[in-house]
């Protein structure tokens, strides 16, 4: 048994460009709190019971109000450590999830609103009893600095908290076969207390309360010699008295899962699938209500007003699991065709297409202009085995993304000045010329080569070319 301890040092903008905006404002003051979830082993796969080693929620931090115009500083943190007690051995390798939550304290209807600010995850090796390990993790533009350690609760010691210690009976040395307890040199390693009645000759234990048999012995207390003859069934007889091989107790015998959890055997141990409201290795951690914020990733918590009634998390798009702890990898379904790259933006899927394809799922082959590959109202035109964009007025370039300069081609003749206009271009003609592009000379006698200037328009006035 022992405790995993997490100390948050700072949470604020990370280095580099793109500092995040402060999560709180004068209109919407807020405070932070943290949630840690621990799982044994190095598996990134979140089980349905997500925090098999345990989880903890910090206190709420001080209320913070952003100073107008100031960048987000390191935000004020809750006091104290986050502590996750573990009842069994410390696994040595573990996965963690640390979530930073914002509690908005404006005048929301129905109390404060929670939203997830940042989520970091990692996999680490850690021996119990060691020094604090420091870590820095980044989530988007945010940076979280923290330290963690695992320590054993007396009388347990060792890197896995499986050895037991007791005070020395004599000041000089420990009893026969027992070593001093590092780091508690004034104590002695205690012999493990096996299951009551476990045969001292034929049984042994690696964990308190168990009874494992030496070869040739069987039975719950290792008192039955194994005989391979006269067995009545492939698994051995139902009674141990015949001296046949009886399988020892399976890891799920007697259902170690509390609170209605269901047990399934794993290659090395067992796994409990817990009902809502309970978690931990044996579903022993209970009393979680919506007030504890059990729904990850912005899930909406419903019910669970008191510790006896279960809560339900309604997950936002892209998340699932009883605590919304599992991200649905929608890109794993490979929705983007023709070599397109998939982005799961949370609120939507986006496909980045390879050259030659377009469309929401890169389903259109651009050779046949089926895909809309032209921006700003341009239309696709086939030709020469490739597509072209015929651009709307005012736009140009390969895909009509460039704002066209209608004056670039010098369309005004005879020294006329060109002006770009929202509907095209306007030519201001030099004296003696007129027309949309100043292409017509004005006759010396004042008559024009054109029929007549429109009323109110003198020769030399700007002519709009449409």
């Amino acid at each position: 048994a022992g405790v995993f301890e997490l100390q948050i040092h700072s949470f604020g903008p990370g280095p580099g460009p793109g500092a995040p905006r402060s999560p709180c404002s004068a209109r919407l003051p807020c405070r932070l709190f943290f949630r840690v979830c621990l799982k044994p082993g190095l598996s990134e796969e979140a089980a349905e019971s997500p925090c098999a080693l345990g989880a903890a929620l910090s206190a709420r931090g001080p209320v913070y109000t952003e100073q107008p115009g100031a960048p987000a500083p390191d935000l004020p943190l809750p006091d104290g450590l986050l502590q996750v007690p573990f009842r069994d051995a410390w696994p040595g390798t573990f996965s963690f999830i640390i979530e930073t939550w914002r509690e908005e304290l404006g005048d929301q209807i129905g109390g404060p609103a929670w939203s997830l600010l940042a989520r970091v995850a990692g996999r680490r090796r850690l021996a119990a009893g060691g020094p604090w390990a420091r870590d820095i993790q980044r989530a988007g533009a945010w940076e979280l600095r923290f330290s963690y350690r695992a320590r054993c609760e007396p009388p347990a010691v060792g890197t896995a908290c499986t050895r037991l210690c007791r005070p020395r009976s004599a000041p000089s040395r420990c009893g026969p076969g027992l070593r001093p307890c590092a780091p508690l040199e004034d104590e002695c390693e205690a012999p493990l207390v096996c299951r009551a009645g476990c045969s001292p000759e034929h049984g042994f234990c690696e964990q308190p309360g168990e009874c494992r048999c030496l070869e040739g012995w069987t039975g719950p207390l290792c008192t039955v010699p194994v005989s391979t003859s006269s067995c009545l069934s492939p698994r051995g007889p139902s009674s141990a008295t015949t001296g046949c091989l009886v399988p020892g107790p399976g890891p799920c015998d007697g259902n170690p899962c509390a609170n209605g959890g269901s047990c399934s055997e794993t290659p090395r141990s067992f796994e409990c699938t817990c009902p809502r409201g309970f978690y931990g290795l044996r579903c022993e951690v209970s009393g979680v209500t919506c007030a504890d914020g059990p729904c990850f990733n912005g899930g909406l918590c419903v019910g669970g007003a008191d510790p006896d009634s279960a809560y339900i998390c309604h997950c936002p798009p892209g998340f699932q699991g009883s605590n919304c702890e599992k991200r649905v990898d929608r890109c794993s379904l490979q929705p983007c065709r023709n070599g397109g790259l998939c982005l799961d933006l949370g609120h939507a899927l986006r496909c980045r297409c390879r050259a030659g394809f377009a469309g929401p799922r890169c389903e259109h082959d651009l050779d046949d202009c089926a895909g809309r590959a032209c921006a700003n109202g341009g239309t696709c035109v086939e030709g020469g085995g490739a597509h072209r964009c015929s651009c709307a007025l005012g736009f140009g370039g390969r895909d009509c993304r460039e704002r066209a300069d209608p004056c670039a081609a010098r369309p005004c003749a005879h020294g006329g000045r060109c002006y770009a206009h929202f509907s095209g271009l306007v030519c201001a003609c030099a004296p003696g010329y007129m027309g949309a592009r100043c292409e017509f000379p004005v006759h010396p006698d004042g008559a024009s080569a054109l029929p007549a200037a429109p009323p109110g328009l003198r020769p030399g006035d700007p002519q709009r070319y449409l």
Epitope: L341, A355, R401
Partner: antibody, heavy 120, light 111 residues
Framework: QVQLVQSGAEVKKPGASVKVSCKAS????????IHWVRQAPGQCLEWMGW????????EYASKFQGRVTITADTSANTAYMELSSLRSEDTAVYYC?????????????WGQGTLVTVSS | DVQMTQSPSSLSASVGDRVTITCKSS???????????LNWLQQKPGQAPKLLLY???KLESGVPSRFSGSGSGTDYTLTISSLQPEDFATYYC????????FGCGTKLEIK
């Protein structure tokens, strides 16, 4: 008009890091991949990596893995390429390039290039 | 990694000549989507490269039709049908089927 404008030339000592910027105009970098390519004197062009500014995804050429970091500041419409542990053979012109809003793997628009000189 | 081998490394020609540059890849550039991601770029001294052709033979917008591309599998060709003074430059092939690899260039000089 689509344009990529890069930061000015840099002179660095071996072992140092350099960070080159690439400011985009005429389009939003969230709509496109920004690629980085370098050209050492008299050498081939080398692709270094790309960033998808929409979600920060990056991919790097194996040769530069661990030494190059490509980032983007979407609010400034600017991408950055940082190369660490510089050595003399990193002396090169570094280009940023982008594709089009409908295709991520074409090098249609290029920056003017940034000369990085590594010398003791 | 895919290797791209260009030949010749340099070439002298005159205005009006027909010029061919070849590029060979170490593995097929045919993508599972049926397209072949082979591009050609032109670079003039002191300038950034410029895209000429993509998907083997598709002309980039604004590129003169005297430039053409062909090939499949591992062998590709850039052809300039009638050299113009502004075509003297270095030409690179670039494959984007398997990440991104450039050829080492062919310098086209005036004879």
């Amino acid at each position: 008009q689509v344009q990529l404008v890069q930061s000015g030339a840099e002179v660095k000592k071996p072992g140092a890091s350099v960070k080159v910027s690439c400011k985009a105009s005429g389009f939003n970098i969230k709509d496109d991949y920004i690629h980085w390519v370098r050209q050492a004197p008299g050498q081939c062009l080398e692709w270094m990596g790309w960033i998808d500014s929409e979600n920060g995804d990056t991919e790097y050429a194996s040769k530069f893995q661990g030494r190059v970091t490509i980032t983007a500041d979407t609010s400034a419409n600017t991408a950055y390429m940082e190369l660490s542990s510089l050595r003399s053979e990193d002396t090169a012109v570094y280009y940023c390039a982008t594709s089009t809003y409908w295709s991520y793997d074409l090098f249609v628009y290029w920056g003017q290039g940034t000369l990085v000189t590594v010398s003791s | 990694d895919v290797q791209m081998t260009q030949s010749p490394s340099s070439l002298s020609a005159s205005v009006g000549d027909r010029v061919t540059i070849t590029c060979k890849s170490s593995q097929s550039l045919l993508h599972s989507n049926g397209k072949t991601y082979l591009n050609w770029l032109q670079q003039k001294p002191g300038q950034a490269p410029k895209l000429l052709l993509y998907l083997v033979s598709k002309l980039e917008s604004g590129v003169p039709s005297r430039f053409s591309g062909s090939g499949s599998g591992t062998d590709y060709t850039l052809t300039i049908s009638s050299l113009q003074p502004e075509d003297f430059a270095t030409y690179y092939c670039l494959q984007t089927t398997h990440l991104y690899t450039f050829g080492c260039g062919t310098k086209l000089e005036i004879k």
